[in-house]
């Protein structure tokens, strides 16, 4: 922590400028007025401070704004943003996409996923919903950042905005996020023809229920294995061998490569071996011929 001292008269600061890079930490703490710093934040990032010195400036801003920085300060944080913790950022109210862009540029390529996720969260809260302009900004300046949002925040995406989302923006989305986004995508693309619809809906299919996957199997979509492997396990298990064959089309041969991986492995275990044999892929692990399958979960539910 920076110790308190009085500022020597010759070191008094009247404006934020490059002379401050020659101040020791103690002198910065004693001589820089926090209100002056806040008023001239737009100058700070152009001055070649060390991060050690930026820590002192952050400390001054924290004291001036214990409830969180105003957006006029946040917008000009520059590399000082790298010193912010998620706890700091949670106190902010951010509504401007210019602020978001500026900070995303600074954090690009750094290990700041927690801070960036919190920042985006604050922007969504500040703007009231995840609107098209926000999504456009995220996809342009932070591919993959959409998936840093919680399912609750993603639920504020209007279906009309889904079209702006690119496949690579969903690469890091988990099942719970895709569960939220898939119904919106289904609604957004509902008026498209079969092949066009499939191209658009494909990145979102990790959130699709069984009935929708079954419906796709009737449309000659020739789903690639990478997409199939991202389907929910619960959506894949009820599919019949014939449905999977129709769903994958020529890509069905890829099942052999993936037979030890979920959801393919789990799906194989639920199929009759003689049905699997009809694929001619040598898939093993199905239910042997002549065995009776009792679904005890149904009986338990009735009792």
């Amino acid at each position: 922590d920076v110790e308190r001292t009085t500022c020597p008269p010759e070191k008094e600061v009247h404006e934020i400028d490059e002379s401050l890079i020659f101040y020791k930490k103690r002198e910065l703490e004693a001589c820089v007025d926090a209100a002056l710093l806040a008023a001239q934040m737009d100058r700070v990032d152009a001055i070649p401070f060390t991060y050690e010195q930026l820590d002192v400036l952050k400390h001054k801003l924290d004291e001036l704004y214990p409830q969180g920085y105003p957006e006029s300060v946040i917008r000009h944080l520059g590399h000082l943003f790298l010193k912010m913790s998620p706890e700091d950022i949670r106190k902010w109210n951010v509504t401007s996409l210019e602020t978001l862009k500026a900070l995303l540029k600074v954090s690009k390529g750094h290990e700041m996923s927690a801070q960036v996720a919190t920042l985006i969260d604050r922007v969504v809260v500040g703007r009231g919903q995840l609107d098209k302009d926000t999504v456009d900004t995220l996809t342009a300046f932070c591919p993959g950042c959409l998936c840093s949002l919680s399912p609750e925040r993603l639920s504020s995406v209007p279906p009309s905005v889904i079209g702006a989302v690119r496949p690579q923006d969903l690469d890091t989305c988990g099942p719970r996020q895709l569960d939220v986004l898939y119904p919106k995508a289904r609604l957004a693309f509902q008026n498209m023809s079969g092949s066009e619809y499939f191209v658009k809906i494909r990145p979102f299919l990790g959130g699709a229920p069984t009935e929708d996957v079954k419906a796709l199997s009737q449309q000659n979509v020739s789903m690639d294995l990478a997409t199939f492997m991202k389907l929910r396990r619960e959506a894949v298990l009820p599919l019949t061998v014939a449905e999977v064959q129709k769903l994958l089309g020529p890509h069905v041969e890829g099942l052999k490569v993936e037979e030890q991986h979920s959801p393919v492995r789990d799906w194989i275990l639920k199929q009759r071996q003689d049905d699997l044999d009809t694929l001619g892929l040598g898939l093993q692990g199905g239910i042997p011929n002549g065995y009776l399958i009792l679904d005890l979960s149904v009986r338990e539910a009735l009792s």
């Epitope: 070649p48 401070f49 060390t50 991060y51 590399h79 010193k83 750094h110 290990e111």
Partner: nanobody, 116 residues
Framework: QVQLQESGGGLVQPGGSLRLSCATS????????MGWFRQAPGEQRELVAR???????MYADSVKGRFTISRDNAKNTVLLQMNSLKPEDTAVYYC??????????WGQGTQVTVSS
């Protein structure tokens, strides 16, 4: 992470000169160029001179006209030519830089003692 190694320090009489060298183990991606800092006993570290990425040089008032910072890109070194040395220049001298990720890097330091 790029290593920094200072050399060239020593004992010198007032009015004398020393040339400090900072060798880097690789290419540095610095947000604020390279700086020479010093720390006297019981004092905090202070910047003495800085050379920015574009070659601009900056000096503390206390060393202006006496110290010169320069860069030899071919040898990956940053130099500090110190002339007209004074007893108050006695300190451990460090070279350092700040990356784009929020971290400052420093060498191990080289001792400069100005005494008769």
């Amino acid at each position: 992470q790029v290593q920094l190694q200072e050399s060239g320090g020593g004992l010198v009489q007032p009015g004398g000169s020393l040339r400090l060298s900072c060798a880097t183990s690789g290419t540095i991606f610095s947000r604020n160029g390279m700086g020479w800092f010093r720390q006297a006993p019981g004092e905090q570290r202070e910047l003495v001179a800085r050379i920015l990425n574009d070659g601009t040089t900056m000096y503390a008032d206390s060393v202006k006209g006496r110290f010169t910072i320069s860069r030899d890109n071919a040898k990956n070194t940053v130099l500090l030519q110190m002339n007209s040395l004074k007893p108050e220049d006695t300190a451990v001298y460090y070279c350092g830089y700040s990356d784009y990720r929020g971290t400052d890097y420093w060498g191990q330091g080289t001792q400069v003692t100005v005494s008769s």
